[in-house]
């Protein structure tokens, strides 16, 4: 092909090539042709004769103002036609007359202000019709019943002001899963407008200034329809009462989106008419008081999003939002509750009472004063089968004994990004008999004891990053009870002292993060009592991160037991010479990171075993000594390996001898070196 199109598997991509005409030299068997973002003004039907196999044609983002009816004659198998972002203004009955197999027609962002006659009457197989971002002033798309297989009609961002039954009755035989009317200026729903449609399952009216009154009328018009999903996001619904959604009593609505409404007052029994509702989106509102009966009737809701729904009006404490006790008691089927980013004063004793199916609860950044978790804090969740609890970003400073004793089903507890500073006696976790993960990273300080985790032997993941960990060198180890642990993160704690039994018995450990500590002394031969082999016995360890610890020595047998190690990160240390057989047992190693150390020599006797099955190597920014003895083997290996070595050309540079300083390692000439073959 003389054009710069890329062709792969019968798909031709000719986008962004400044083309002014359709290429005539593409393979004739292509089924998908992408001509977007070019300078095409027309699509001569003759140019498509050779591409009769096309099922998808995308000519979006051009300057096409007219379509030849013969185009589809040449493309009998065409199913998807995308004409978005062009300059079409008129559609005649002939325009798509031969496009009888279309399932998708995209006409968004053109200049179509009116649909005359019946341009879509022949599209009996059409499933999606996108006319959004045009200048349409009505929903009138024809004068006779048509589009019987249409499922998605997208009319957002037009100038539609009224919905009329006589305009929508062309869909009398259609089952619309999605009628998208967002971002219009609708002010009227004429009687029977939705009944004109055969079946309407989804209606989207986001960014339409409905307000409480028009919303109520809308719902009355939706009565006795098949509506399942209703989206009214950003529709200026500032208040709801027990009549707002009355019309929906005669529907089986399962999804309702009321997000971004600045909703202030949720009156009692506002949703009493929605017993079938399952998914309820209320995020980004401004509810000042949730009454005990505000959510009454929502017996089937499984998912409720209240993110940023309760925000304070001013700095005055009196203006904090209120949630009455028992407000959620009606939600017997609720499984997922998101209450992130709110300004709720605290947790009352019956705040969550009645949520007998709740499995996921996010309370991240939810409270203005939740400094201490007591044994009463979560009493209202005692009968909830909660599996995941997120308490991040709440400025929690203390966890008292039995704080979670009500949560016997809990599997994941996230307490990260708080201000917890205390000795962990272990009583904090009492009752967490099924706990799988505790995330405590990014807190003030944690002092461990031998019993810190004595009551949670089921724990598999423990995250203790940047918590100013104290007493980690006690014996027995605080981690001794955690025989099921697979992930342990102790990074960023400036740990300088640990014992060789710190990880003893953790035979299931797979991931160990110890980066950004101060462990260098432990591996020095001059260490009193010799090096400390704190990695011994970790036979199932897969990932080991020891970055930024100041290591300048590695004892020869330190990785001896790590037979399953796949990834090791020793970057940003001060390593110069490594012992000959240090990696001998790492037969499964896939990734090795030694960047930013002081390595001058990469010899086979040290690195040969580690490099054997490597898929990724990072040794950037080391001061390589470009001599035969130091790097000949490495250079030959580099030039023959399939291992991924990022930035090999730019960041693997010789430091010595002086005449090679700054010279790329991979270009070092090994031809004069003896015995440097990388593979035997």
């Amino acid at each position: 092909s003389t054009t710069k199109c890329t062709v792969s598997h019968e798909v031709a991509d000719c986008s962004h090539l400044k083309l002014t005409q359709v290429p005539d030299d593409l393979p004739t068997n292509i089924t998908v042709l992408n001509l977007t973002h070019n300078q095409l003004r027309r699509l001569p039907a003759a140019n498509f004769t050779r591409y009769s196999q096309l099922t998808s044609l995308d000519v979006g983002f051009n300057t096409i103002s007219k379509l030849e009816p013969e185009l589809c004659q040449k493309l009998p198998m065409l199913k998807v036609l995308n004409l978005q972002h062009n300059e079409l203004s008129q559609l005649s009955d002939k325009t798509f007359a031969f496009c009888t197999n279309l399932t998708e027609l995209h006409l968004m962002s053109n200049s179509i202000q009116k649909i005359k006659n019946n341009p879509f009457v022949k599209q009996k197989n059409l499933i999606t019709l996108d006319l959004s971002h045009n200048g349409l002033s009505s929903t009138k798309l024809g004068t006779q019943v048509q589009l019987e297989n249409l499922q998605e009609l997208l009319l957002s961002n037009n100038k539609i002001q009224a919905l009329k039954s006589e305009e929508l009755d062309i869909f009398a035989n259609s089952s619309l899963k999605k009628l998208e009317l967002s971002s219009n200026q609708i002010k009227e729903f004429s009687p029977g407008c939705f009944h004109a449609i055969g079946r309407l399952f989804g209606l989207f009216l986001n960014n339409v200034q409905l307000g409480p009154s028009l919303t109520e009328k809308l719902c009355l018009e939706l009565a006795n329809t098949s509506i399942r999903n209703l989206s009214l996001s950003n529709s200026q619904l500032s208040t709801t009462s027990n009549t707002t959604f009355l019309g929906l009593k005669w529907t089986n609505l399962t999804m309702l989106d009321l997000s971004y409404n600045n909703l202030n007052v949720v009156g009692n029994d506002s949703f009493a008419w929605l017993p079938q509702l399952e998914y309820f989106f209320l995020e980004y509102n401004n509810i000042q008081h949730l009454f005990s009966h505000s959510l009454h009737g929502l017996f089937n809701v499984r998912y409720l999003n209240l993110k940023r729904s309760f925000t304070k009006q001013s700095i005055s404490l009196a203006s904090l939002p209120k949630i009455d006790d028992f407000s959620f008691q009606w939600l017997k089927c609720l499984e997922h509750l998101n209450m992130e980013d709110n300004d709720i004063p605290g947790i009352k004793s019956n705040m969550f009472t009645g949520l007998i199916n709740l499995k996921y609860l996010s309370l991240s950044n939810s409270f203005t004063s939740l400094r201490t978790l007591t044994n009463e804090t979560f009493v209202s969740l005692a009968h909830s089968p909660l599996h995941i609890l997120n308490l991040t970003k709440n400025k929690i400073s203390k966890i008292e004994s039995d704080a979670f004793s009500w949560l016997g089903h809990l599997e994941v507890l996230d307490l990260g990004l708080n201000e917890i500073g205390q000795e962990l006696t272990g009583q904090e976790w009492r009752g967490l008999e099924n706990i799988f993960e505790i995330y405590l990273s990014y807190n003030k300080y944690l002092q461990l004891t031998r019993n810190s985790f004595a009551l949670v032997p089921s724990l598999q993941r423990l995250m203790l990053r940047r918590v100013a960990l104290k007493n980690v060198d006690s014996s027995p180890s605080p981690f001794q009870p955690l025989r099921n642990l697979t992930i342990l993160d102790l990074s960023n704690n400036n740990i300088a002292n640990i014992n060789d039994d710190m990880l003893e018995g953790l035979e299931k450990l797979e991931i160990l993060d110890l980066q950004h500590n101060n462990l260098a002394r432990l591996w020095k031969h001059a260490n009193p009592g010799g090096p400390i082999y704190f990695l011994k016995g970790l036979s199932h360890l897969h990932i080991l991160n020891l970055e930024s610890n100041g290591f300048d020595e590695i004892p020869v047998e330190v990785f001896k037991d790590l037979f399953e190690l796949k990834i090791i990160d020793l970057g940003l240390n001060n390593l110069n010479t490594l012992p000959a057989s240090v990696f001998n047992n790492q037969v499964s190693l896939k990734s090795l990171n030694l960047q930013k150390n002081l390595i001058t020599s990469v010899e086979k006797k040290v690195f040969g075993p580690a490099f054997r099955n490597l898929t990724e190597l990072d040794m950037r920014f080391n001061p390589f000594d470009c001599t035969c003895e130091s790097i000949a083997w490495f250079v030959n290996w580099i030039n023959e390996t399939h291992t991924n070595i990022p930035e090999l050309s730019s960041h693997y540079l010789c430091n010595t001898p002086p005449h090679y300083h700054g010279f790329p390692v991979r270009l070092f000439d090994t031809s004069s070196c003896k015995d440097s073959a990388p593979f035997e």
Epitope: N451, A454, Q480, P481, D501, E504
Partner: antibody, heavy 119, light 107 residues
């Protein structure tokens, strides 16, 4: 199943030493600390100390620190407790014990070794 | 060191009786308290740990309660095989001291 089998009864003279053994089976010896507890005739139980069979690290009860030595031989999965400078009030049954999944109780005990100190 | 004080030191009761033994710690041991049963010539047997959790195979007539410094072992309906000596022991910090024992005898 986990078993702790102790050595037989001993009779010792005051001032002598005694070494009691505790052979473990049914689990990996090096992964659980071994504790020693004694009981004088007609008296209560007294915790003496604990040893990590993996590295030999020990936490003693201060009361016994100067006279007790706890050791282990991992090759034969055996822990030892040696008490020196024996006195008559050291006459007791000496037990070894081990924690379980919960490290806050002793589900496993040896059968006990009676040490009699008599001139 | 934390001292453990058990009471009473001995107790006479009949089969079917409800019996309560108490144990007081000289400092806060949270809930790290275990109860053991010992019969003459035998090693102690674990009954309860973490103040209230029943050890494997222990009949439900045994129960434990308490937290901090005051703890209780209750036998709801004494059976003939329950006559023995009972000890509490803390597991908060070394040394793991025992109570002096409570001898439960047939009345």
């Amino acid at each position: 199943q986990v078993q702790l089998v102790q050595s037989g009864a001993e009779v010792k003279k005051p001032g002598a030493s005694v070494k009691v053994s505790c052979k473990a089976s049914g689990y990996t010896f090096t992964t659980y600390w071994i504790h020693w507890v004694r009981q004088a005739p007609g008296q209560g139980l007294e915790w003496m100390g604990e040893i990590n069979p993996n590295n030999g690290r020990i936490n003693y009860n201060e009361k016994f620190k100067t006279r007790v030595t706890m050791t282990r031989d991992t090759s034969i999965s055996t822990a030892y407790m040696e008490l020196s400078r024996l006195r008559s009030d050291d006459t007791a049954v000496y037990y070894c014990a081990r924690v379980g999944v919960m490290i806050t109780t002793f589900p496993y005990w040896g059968q006990g070794t009676l040490v009699t100190v008599s001139s | 060191d934390i001292q453990m004080t058990q009471s009473p030191s001995s107790l006479s009761a009949s089969v079917g009786d409800r019996v309560t033994i108490t144990c007081r710690a000289s400092g806060n041991i949270h809930n790290y308290l275990a109860w053991f049963q010992q019969k003459p010539g035998k090693a102690p047997k674990s009954l309860i740990y973490n103040a209230k959790t029943l050890a494997d195979g222990v009949p439900s007539r045994f129960s434990g309660s308490g937290s901090g410094t005051d703890f209780t072992l209750t036998i709801s309906s004494l059976q003939p095989e329950d006559f023995a000596t009972y000890y509490c022991q803390h597991f908060w910090s070394t040394p793991f001291t025992f109570g002096q024992g409570t001898k439960l005898e047939i009345k």
